[in-house]
């Protein structure tokens, strides 16, 4: 609801930093609750950026105060079931406006991180977070997108005409008309044969199976090389020299080490922790993170996962840090919104990658015969008669300025305007009084209506 200096933190200062007008953007990032900030830098549950962005102008000598934030919601679409426990990261970015701002145009002012527990469908939770000298007041809540309902958005409730035993306000849920609750949604990829779940997004293994998706037989577990499986409670004995030694990836999968463990990149047609699951078809849902599965109608034909933006790998299992590419030109700020990459451009630039210079006549044409004029570090369009607007796209009403003097009637014409003068007046704008004795016409004193030059819309 507001952002500004915290109480009792030395000399109060404005977020605009006494450098002229500025805008504040808020980037909201959701991470799994179990993730550690140091190891998990990706917004795996989703991310979004504020769009309702007013300009704040600081007046010299004014005492710095918290800036009120607009009511515009920041909506973060989350994938799969709502986990309940999550890490909430809110970054406050300042864009300095104005020609004489000096210094960088973009600054990360504050970054608040905190673990939260929140059921979907509950009321707004209010919070105050302090970081450094800044204080952020905000509210948050989680809501399910229909037809999902419940604290984890894991139940799919579609209206059914069949009679039901459900209580008031509750509807029976597909696929069980006699039930008011559908089974929880397990972690994506959890083995349907060897895994089950009691809570959303979990994967509990049946006896004899292990691994995060219950795809690894305990007999081979994660014990590599000379490591031997110990009792179920103790795991592996005799640790070997490296997680990829002996290549734990089956079926031609390639192994890579990741923070003391390993990761298998599986060839098409195989997946699982060690690429041990084969004969997979699209019906098995092998594509993660919203990937689209094509082909693979039967176990003998390979499927292909078409990954959504931000994911890659044969099963769309890997998230890509796309901002590391630095796609934004001309000092634009890269923001990974999860589903899309967005460049926030500095003033005077536009385009998906801030590639268009709006202050440059070479970068933008004027429509309808208008002429581009540069000056003072900016550009404008000098429009042809009859056109107006920033790019001369708007048809102007040449009669709007009442250019015909002395009661003359104005008519719009394709080349401008025509004045039909009242009796006793003549001239392009009816500016001359006609002498009855035939002498030369003379400019007449204005009579109610002012004389006007031909109007051009800029």
């Amino acid at each position: 609801h507001s952002f500004g200096p915290g109480p009792g933190l030395g000399t109060p200062r404005s977020p605009c930093n006494a450098r002229g007008p500025c805008r504040l953007f808020f980037r909201v990032c959701l991470k799994p609750g179990v993730s550690q900030e140091a190891t998990e830098s990706l917004c795996a549950l989703g991310a979004a950026l504020s769009t309702s962005v007013p300009v704040y102008t600081e007046h010299p000598g004014e005492s710095a105060a918290a800036l009120p934030l607009p009511d515009g919601l920041v909506r973060v679409p989350f994938r799969d079931a709502w986990p309940g426990t999550f890490s909430l990261v809110i970054e406050t970015w300042r864009e300095q406006l104005g020609e004489h701002a000096g210094g960088p145009a973009w600054n990360l002012l504050a970054r608040v991180v905190g673990r939260r527990r929140l059921a979907a469908g509950g009321p707004w939770a209010r919070d105050v977070q302090r970081t450094g000298t800044w204080e952020l007041h905000f509210s948050y809540r989680a809501r399910c997108e229909p037809p999902a309902v419940g604290a984890a958005c894991a139940r799919l409730c579609r209206s059914r005409s069949a009679p039901s035993r459900c209580g008031p306000g509750l509807r029976p849920c597909t696929p069980f008309p006699d039930e008011c609750e559908a089974p929880s949604v397990c972690r994506p990829g959890c083995s349907p044969e060897h895994g089950y779940c009691e809570e959303p997004d979990e994967c509990r293994c049946l006896e004899g199976w292990t691994g995060p998706l219950c795809t690894v037989p305990v007999s081979t577990s994660s014990c590599l090389n000379s490591r031997v499986p110990g009792p179920a409670s103790t795991g592996c004995l005799l640790p070997g020299p490296g997680p990829c030694d002996g290549n734990p990836c089956a079926n031609g999968g390639s192994c890579s080490e990741t923070s003391g463990s390993f990761e298998c990149a599986c060839p098409r047609g195989f997946y699982g922790l060690r690429c041990e699951v084969s004969g997979v078809t699209c019906a098995d849902g092998p594509c993660f993170n919203g990937g689209l599965c094509v082909g693979g109608e039967d176990p003998d034909s390979a499927y292909v996962c078409h990954c959504p933006p931000g994911f890659q790998g044969s099963n769309c299992e890997k998230r890509v840090d796309r901002c590391s590419l630095q796609p934004c030109q001309n000092g634009g700020l890269c923001l990974d919104l999860g589903h899309a990459l967005r460049c926030r451009c500095r003033a005077g630039f536009a385009g998906p990658r801030c590639e268009h210079d709006l202050d440059d006549c070479a970068g933008r044409a004027c429509a309808n015969g208008g002429t581009c004029v540069e000056g003072g570090g900016s550009r404008r369009c000098s429009c042809a008669l009859g056109f107006g607007g920033r790019d001369c796209r708007e048809r102007a009403d040449p009669c709007a300025s009442r250019p015909c003097a002395h009661g003359g009637r104005c008519y719009a014409h394709f080349s401008g305007l025509v004045c039909a003068c009242a009796p006793g007046y003549m001239g392009v704008r009816c500016e001359f009084a006609v002498r009855p004795d035939g002498a030369d016409a003379v400019p007449a004193a204005p009579r109610g209506l002012r004389q006007a030059d031909p109007q051009r819309f800029l």
């Epitope: 769009t51 679409p77 933006p309 796309r322 590419l325 630095q326 796609p327 934004c328 030109q329 890269c334 919104l337 589903h339 899309a340 990459l341 967005r342 460049c343 536009a350 385009g351 998906p352 990658r353 590639e355 268009h356 970068g363």
Partner: antibody, heavy 118, light 112 residues
Amino acid sequence: EVQLQQSGAELVRPGALVKLSCKASGFNFKDYYIHWVKQRPELGLEWIGWIDPENGNAIYDPKFQDKASITADTSSNTAYLHLSSLTSEGTAVYYCASEDAYYPFAYWGQGTLVTVSA
Amino acid sequence: DIVMSQSPSSLAVSVGEKVTMRCKSSQSLLYSSNQKNYLAWYQQKPGQSPKLLIYWASTRESGVPDRFTGSGSGTDFTLTISSVKAEDLAVYFCQQYYSYRTFGGGTKLEIK
């Protein structure tokens, strides 16, 4: 599933105006730029311009500056291409496509055939 | 404006053959700050909309077979199909997205 659904074919008289639509679904409309591309038989693909639905800013190829106008309605997740003073050279298939900062034209509409004929 | 030129305008090959098509831009598409080339390749099959194959000159789009490879930098770029299949019959366009957007004239791939 990401989709760009374009309006149906149009038969228009020379000198007339036409308004083509491109409805987006499966993604956050405001986070992507929407482009319009013209394709005439044997003449390849010609870029017309783009619009940023977040703020309504539009940029055009100078040769389409007087002929085309692009708008967007965020309430219906729809982008529009307005073509004016059409001649026989306006007969073409017009595509819309979406772009973010990472991917160029990742998703395309199915195209709308505009025929200009007396 | 950046002008994009493609060659050849058409070519006919047998299934299994290697194909190379070229694209030349009138000015460099290499952005010095990130050392990336703002160039993409599209495939348009008869009666269909174009489909993104390659972006950043050499990054293969998800789901695109690995027989398609993009290479080159600056003003000269190449799309290679290592072993042509019958379903590769299409017109291939290059496009720059460095400034405005412009497409090459296309290379029509026919199967003998």
